[in-house]
């Protein structure tokens, strides 16, 4: 039966009809009492006092309502949940993930996890209603957990008309013996000992380091991974593992050349709620590799939206060469990651200036052959974009990737809803298209326009009359991603390049074929 529920937009928690709850007001000491009424939360401030007993984890401050028994936790940065039990910065799980308290909420199939408090799970052995729910990490959220000591975190998903458990696609912290780091590498305990410039690390117990804070003599050395070795570590929460080095007889430090463990192509996909001409409105967390590129024009003040882009590593964005025909100076370009609304700043967005950009030197502005460009983001360190639920790299395809004809893939972008529209979309959109066989991606299928081996075609193959809302890329989507699921990860197959109109029946969009440029990409991204 259909149930009216409320979703608290601030916390993403769900509540049943007539259920009440307390919530802290961000950046203030106020607390609100909320009540679920006909699918809408009605909230007002209430007086509170300090709790009589500690109820919050991870340093949360407990406050209880003055006139009734409920309590609320003000969580320190990096923690969330009713009792601050959720670690919003956990990027991977250790061992079987029994202690995992992160925010991954996507199953291996790509399905979105169901909130553990959902009434649909009331009869399941594990739900947020259990008396030991907090201890097991269950509660009013839909994050992957391993409450039953299974082999890895899992959750309930709704498929084939019922709720069943499915393993999650949460990244594992230690992938076999691969020597790489997750997040900022503060948990890295591998054996790399060379810096990015090729210098050898000094042992953390070296006499030369006397007087330095982070050495084997630090009282917390063991917990920080420091000792009688010269392995790279990140004891101070820096951007990535580093070490002390001697450079020209001077003591300094450098970041290490430890590779970061790839979480590329993993995302927390949420089913789009709104159809729109040419596609569906989407959230950036579903397409965390999507970049928005803005440009300052010599003639007009301010910045205007230019093109889409694709995050392929911390400091590099892939885009389409034709977006840069105006030859903008790099300092006139801005790249924004983590933004759902094209011109409205997102809470977790990351904004970058551009160090330089490289347009393929054989780009043909008549045919759009070799329509590919790379932008290097500007940063003070060797890291630029910080991974989060809304910012993550896409996977580059293996060189020999050959997906079957008609494979369903997706594209995203902030482009127009239809060819004749004067405006770009105000919100990120996604579209679902299928890969055309090369026999259907030729000049004769595209009004005699040149189609080269560096291009591929994809389009919406659904039938429908003239009013059918066929999915496609459109003006403004250029430079953005065409991604397909491969080995459980979203993999970049094409770069949105050109097309004849938008969303026309039997007329596919044309994309730059990424597998043809892997060596070019790698070559140009060299340090």
């Amino acid at each position: 039966s259909y149930q009216v529920i409320c979703r608290d937009e601030k916390t993403q928690m769900i509540y049943q009809q007539h259920q009440s709850w307390l919530r802290p007001v961000l950046r203030s000491n106020r607390v609100e009492y909320c009540w679920c009424n006909s699918g809408r939360a009605q909230c007002h401030s209430v007086p509170v006092k300090s709790c009589s007993e500690p109820r919050c984890f991870n340093g949360g401050t407990c406050q209880q309502a003055l006139y009734f028994s409920d309590f609320v936790c003000q969580c320190p940065e990096g923690f969330a949940g009713k009792c601050c039990e959720i670690d919003t910065r956990a990027t991977c799980y250790e061992d079987q993930g029994i202690s995992y308290r992160g925010t991954w909420s996507t199953a291996e199939s790509g399905a979105e996890c169901t909130n553990w408090n959902s009434s649909a799970l009331a009869q399941k052995p594990y739900s947020g209603r259990r008396p030991d729910a907090i201890r097991l990490g269950l509660g009013n959220h839909n994050y992957c957990r391993n409450p039953d000591r299974d082999s890895k975190p899992w959750c309930y998903v709704f498929k084939a008309g019922k709720y069943s458990s499915e393993f999650c696609s949460t990244p594992a912290c230690s992938e076999g013996n691969s020597d790489c780091y997750f997040g900022n590498g503060s948990a890295y305990r591998g054996t790399h000992s060379l810096t990015e410039s090729g210098a050898s690390c000094l042992p953390w117990n070296s006499m030369i380091l006397i007087g330095k804070v982070y050495t084997a003599q630090n009282p917390s050395a063991q917990a920080l991974g420091l000792g009688k070795h010269n392995y790279c570590r990140n004891p101070d929460g820096d951007a990535k593992p580093w070490c002390h080095v001697l450079k020209n007889r001077r003591l300094t430090w450098e970041y290490c050349d430890v590779p970061s463990c790839s979480t590329c192509g993993l995302r927390q996909y949420s089913q789009p709620q709104f159809r729109i001409k040419g596609g569906l409105f989407a959230d950036i967390a579903s397409h965390p590799w999507q970049a928005a590129i803005f440009a300052k024009h010599r003639r007009s003040p301010g910045e205007r939206f230019l093109c889409g882009g694709i995050l392929i590593s911390s400091c590099w964005i892939l885009s389409a060469a034709h977006c840069f025909q105006e030859r903008f100076p790099p300092h006139h370009l801005t790249v924004i990651l983590g933004r759902t609304y094209r011109v409205v700043p997102g809470e977790e967005e990351q904004k970058f200036e551009v160090e330089k950009y490289i347009v393929h030197k054989e780009f043909d502005d008549d045919t759009y052959d070799n329509d590919i460009a790379l932008l290097q983001l500007k940063s003070d360190s060797s890291r630029c974009a910080q991974e989060s639920s809304v910012v993550r790299t896409v996977c580059l395809p293996p060189a020999d990737l050959q997906l079957p004809d008609w494979t369903e893939c997706e594209l995203s972008g902030y482009g127009k809803h239809e060819a004749l529209s004067p405006f770009y979309s105000e919100r990120l959109k996604e579209a679902h298209v299928r890969l055309y066989p090369s026999s259907r991606c030729t000049s004769q299928h595209l009004l005699n326009r040149t189609v080269t081996d560096n291009m591929l075609c994809a389009g919406d193959t659904r039938s429908g009359g003239p009013q059918a809302n066929l999915h496609d890329a459109c003006q403004g989507d250029s430079g953005g991603p065409l991604v397909c699921l491969n080995d459980g990860r979203m993999t970049l197959v094409g770069i949105i390049s050109w097309g004849l109109g938008c969303g026309q029946k039997d007329v596919p969009g044309v994309y730059t074929k990424v597998t043809n440029y892997l060596d070019w990409i790698r070559d140009n991204m060299r340090p």
């Epitope: 020597d179 790399h192 590779p259 030197k361």
Partner: antibody, heavy 114, light 112 residues
């Protein structure tokens, strides 16, 4: 530290093919390059492979005769040279490239003789 | 293809004295990403080559500071401030900016 260990010496007849392997340990995400050196001669770059994605770049001189592959599960790169002739007799090196060819294998002598 | 020419072909040296090797490319070796991938390698007798200098002037880890690299565009130089007996071998300059990557012909450094 990256370490590269190559397969042993080979003797081949003209027209045959040879496949040399290069096992990497340490940071295995860098390009593997192949360089050859005929006895008493200089170094000659043959091509490169990205061990992650498997993309390759070959010197024109070897295009069509050389194939570079990799097996990521065992961190090994391979260089196969076909239609061998006597002038292909050389020591073949693999070298790992990040900002330069910083780490080299010990070399594999391939002798082409009838 | 970029042709890389080294001179001299052979360089007899006295320990403690300086030495210099020149390397010239047939065209600019500035990569499209702005970097200049000019490297110097030393191959000691019976050994694999070893990296000395990368990106024109950066010394690789463990390389003594008597080795230095300089230059730009098409002209590059490797200098050894005071040659030591262990520095003998063949020195190669190499460009990694344009495919095919190419080595110079080599300079044989030997003690007088």
């Amino acid at each position: 530290q990256v370490q590269l260990v190559q397969s042993g010496a080979e003797v081949k007849k003209p027209g045959a093919s040879v496949k040399v392997s290069c096992k990497a340990s340490g940071n295995t995400s860098y390009w593997i390059n192949w360089v050859r050196q005929a006895t008493g001669q200089g170094l000659e770059w043959m091509g490169r492979i990205d061990p992650g994605g498997g993309s390759t770049g070959y010197a024109q001189k070897f295009q069509g005769r050389v194939t570079m592959t990799r097996n990521t599960s065992i961190s090994t790169a391979y260089m196969e040279l076909s239609s061998l002739r006597s002038e292909d007799t050389a020591v073949y090196y693999c070298a790992s490239y990040y900002y330069a060819m910083a780490y080299w294998g010990q070399g594999t002598l391939v002798t082409v003789s009838s | 293809d970029v042709v890389v020419t080294q001179s001299p072909l052979s360089l007899p040296v006295t320990p403690g004295e300086p030495a210099s090797i020149s390397c010239r490319s047939s065209q600019s070796i500035v990569h499209s990403n702005g970097n200049t991938y000019l490297e110097w390698y030393l191959q000691k007798p019976g050994q694999s080559p070893q990296l000395l200098i990368y990106k024109v002037s950066n010394r690789f880890s463990g390389v003594p500071d008597r080795f230095s690299g300089s230059g730009s565009g098409t002209d590059f130089t490797l200098k050894i401030s005071r040659v030591e007996a262990e520095d003998v071998g063949v020195y190669y300059c190499f460009q990694g900016s344009h495919v095919p990557w190419t080595f110079g012909g080599g300079t044989k450094v030997e003690i007088k």
